[in-house]
Interface confidence: medium
């Protein structure tokens, strides 16, 4: 999906309003120094591409993030403010429903969400002008 035509200001507002709290809740009890930030992004569409990938693409050691509250809100936000996004996700959602996995918060998942927090911050910093 090409995120170029999203309403970035509205996505930023949704992040500040609700998604950030869910990410903080998920990461509660860990420190940023526990993980190395290895994922970055260079502009707004690129940040959203990386955010989508880390949030919704299962990895061998972290398969369940898409069911977390922050992921559900991220999906709703992208569907709301990125034209045509929801249509591109229908097949992916149906495929996910067939692979029901036990919900486990592994260290790998915590590392992945730590990366997400960094990507969201980077997304916002590409929106804002230094005063």
């Amino acid at each position: 999906y090409d995120f170029t035509n999203c309403d970035f200001q509205k996505i930023e507002a949704d992040y500040l309003r609700t998604i950030s709290k869910d990410l903080i809740t998920y990461m509660s009890g860990t420190k940023s120094t526990d993980f190395n930030n290895t994922v970055s992004c260079s502009n707004r569409p690129h940040c959203l591409t990386e955010i989508q990938s880390l949030t919704f693409n299962p990895t061998p050691r972290c398969a369940s993030l898409a069911k977390e509250m922050f992921a559900r809100k991220t999906k709703a936000t992208l569907a709301l403010w990125c034209p045509g996004y929801s249509e591109t996700q229908i097949n992916a959602t149906q495929a996910m429903k067939k692979r029901r996995k036990r919900k486990v918060t592994t260290n790998k998942c915590l590392e992945q969400v730590s990366q997400l927090l960094g990507l969201w911050r980077r997304f916002i910093r590409t929106l804002l002008k230094k005063q």
């Epitope: 507002a13 500040l16 309003r17 609700t18 950030s20 709290k21 903080i24 809740t25 990461m27 509660s28 009890g29 860990t30 420190k31 940023s32 730590s114 927090l117 911050r121 916002i124 910093r125 804002l128 002008k129 230094k130 005063q131």
Partner: nanobody, 127 residues
Framework: EVQLVESGGGLVQPGGSLRLSCAAS??????????IGWFRQAPGKEREGVSC????????YYADSVKGRFTISRDNSKNTVYLQMNSLRPEDTAVYYC??????????????????WGQGTLVTVSS
């Protein structure tokens, strides 16, 4: 549960002072370098940014309407952020909220719509 609890509000005469506190529970301000800010909402008005503090380098930002009168500070050992309010005016009357993850080092204090994590604390400036 992740929560922010604001306290320290009350009734004060014009020219008086108050110190507001914002205490975090369920997470630690320092853990992810969370930026923290104070916002306020007066009856019938939109919420506005008052002040914020960067958790990375301690940089502070203030709305023009409070510069020179309000001071924001943090105590990571107590997981609390403070707003010292001096020379209070009737127009400072509002419910004051704190919020995290607002990147105050990038934009100073700007208005945005957020769901308050706490109940806020009411400040009334009146003679």
């Amino acid at each position: 549960e992740v929560q922010l609890v604001e306290s320290g509000g009350g009734l004060v005469q014009p020219g008086g002072s108050l110190r507001l506190s914002c205490a975090a529970s369920g997470f630690t301000f320092a853990d992810y370098d969370y930026d923290i800010g104070w916002f306020r909402q007066a009856p019938g008005k939109e919420r506005e940014g008052v002040s914020c503090i960067s958790n990375r380098d301690g940089s502070t930002y203030y709305a023009d309407s409070v510069k020179g009168r309000f001071t924001i500070s943090r105590d990571n050992s107590k997981n609390t952020v403070y707003l010292q309010m001096n020379s209070l005016r009737p127009e400072d009357t509002a419910v004051y909220y704190c919020a995290v993850e607002i990147h105050c080092d990038d934009y100073g204090v700007e208005n945005f719509d957020f769901d308050p994590w706490g109940q806020g604390t009411l400040v009334t400036v009146s003679s």
